[in-house]
């Protein structure tokens, strides 16, 4: 059953290839377990970036070799996407999931249009 | 233990109503947005209708097959949730089951539609 | 809408055995999938949540899999027990919430 979750329609990576956005959603119950992915979206082809599962006041943790991390506040989650280039531009789609207690509810955002752009290199010095 | 306990339904002629009710006990009621959910030998399962909750401001949603015959709704006072079908056709019968989310189900009430 | 294509309808295999049933959604569906068994003469009941969650008090025999528009429900080292027939459920808005055919599994 889908919850609403809200994302930013655009964001511009920086020149470190450092994007982040809030994915905000509409909880209809008293969950205590949430699991929140990022996923990546290109034509009919959709791969998970990033995962993490967190109980309701605590701290969000993504493995340790992830590119994403993110903080939580109430049903706010704060995500941020490192190490991106320009071949990484794409729309990121914010999935939540309500894990615990039953009932399971699930919402898919809209998706994050992410724009990255690869910073010039720059000019040698003499 | 989560019970869901559906009752009201019967034989009924074609173009007549009849009201189904859902009593449930066990789980947080208020919490769960309530389905109702029929089954037939020649459509197998087929969702009918949803009404969520209050942070969901009881939003319903129906399927195209009933749209403007069938209204679901709920009392959260009786942890009860209720489907009036009205104008009931002979595609209309099969076994209703009330769902709290799925993850939950009743055991089904019978409704036959014949003249 | 959203169509639901399960197979096979049917299968028939031994205890012991493996069996993997497919699940393939017209669209993207983000792993908005549920699968339920429902034995013979009872209602269904909730087996995996969400593409890859087992229900509680379901067998960890029982596994889901599957992303973007298929899924697979599998069932290993098969027993007497399992036979009944197994339904996916796209969870996804908008509704309608489409349920598959169904697939009736057999124990030899």
């Known amino acids: 059953k889908a919850m609403h979750v809200a994302q930013p329609a655009v964001v511009l990576a920086n020149s470190r290839g450092t994007a982040s956005f809030v994915c905000e959603y509409a909880s209809p119950g008293k969950a205590t377990e949430v699991r929140v992915t990022v996923l990546r979206q290109a034509d009919s082809q959709v791969t998970e970036v990033c995962a993490a599962t967190y109980m309701m006041g605590n701290e969000l943790t993504f493995l340790d070799d992830s590119i994403c991390t993110g903080t939580s506040s109430g049903n706010q989650v704060n995500l941020t996407i490192q190490g991106l280039r320009a071949m990484d531009t794409g729309l990121y789609i914010c999935k939540v999931e309500l894990m615990y207690p039953p009932p399971y509810y699930m919402g898919i955002g809209n998706g994050t249009q992410i724009y990255v752009i690869d910073p010039e290199p720059c000019p040698d010095s003499d | 233990e989560v019970k869901l306990d559906e009752t009201g339904g019967g034989l009924v002629q074609p173009g007549r109503p009849l009201k189904l009710s859902c009593v449930a006990s066990?789980?947080?009621?208020?919490?769960?947005?309530m389905n109702w959910v029929r089954q037939s030998p020649e459509k197998g399962l087929e969702w009918v209708a949803q009404i969520r909750n209050k942070p969901y401001n009881y939003e319903t949603y129906y399927s195209d097959s009933v749209k403007g015959r069938f209204t679901i709704s709920r009392d959260d006072s009786k942890s009860s949730v209720y489907l009036q079908m009205n104008n009931l056709r002979v595609e209309d019968m099969g076994i209703y089951y009330c769902?709290?989310?799925?993850?939950?189900w009743g055991q089904g009430t019978s409704v036959t539609v014949s003249s | 809408d959203i169509q639901m294509t399960q197979s096979p309808a049917s299968l028939s295999a031994s205890v012991g055995e493996t069996v993997t049933i497919t699940c393939g959604a017209s669209?993207?569906?983000?792993?908005?999938l549920n699968w339920y068994q429902q034995k013979q003469g009872k209602s269904p009941q909730l087996l995996i949540y969400?593409?890859?969650n087992l229900a509680d008090g379901m067998s960890s025999r029982f596994s889901g899999s599957g992303s973007g528009r298929q899924y697979s429900l599998k069932i290993s080292s098969l027993h007497p027990d399992d036979a009944a027939t197994y339904y996916c459920?796209?969870?996804?808005?908008?509704?309608?919430?489409?349920f598959g055919g169904g697939t009736k599994l057999e124990i030899k």
């Open positions: 969400g593409a890859t």
């Open positions: 066990g789980f947080t009621f208020s919490d769960n947005w």
């Open positions: 769902t709290g989310g799925m993850d939950y």
């Open positions: 459920q796209k969870i996804l808005s908008p509704p309608p919430w489409t």
């Open positions: 669209e993207i569906i983000y792993g908005a």
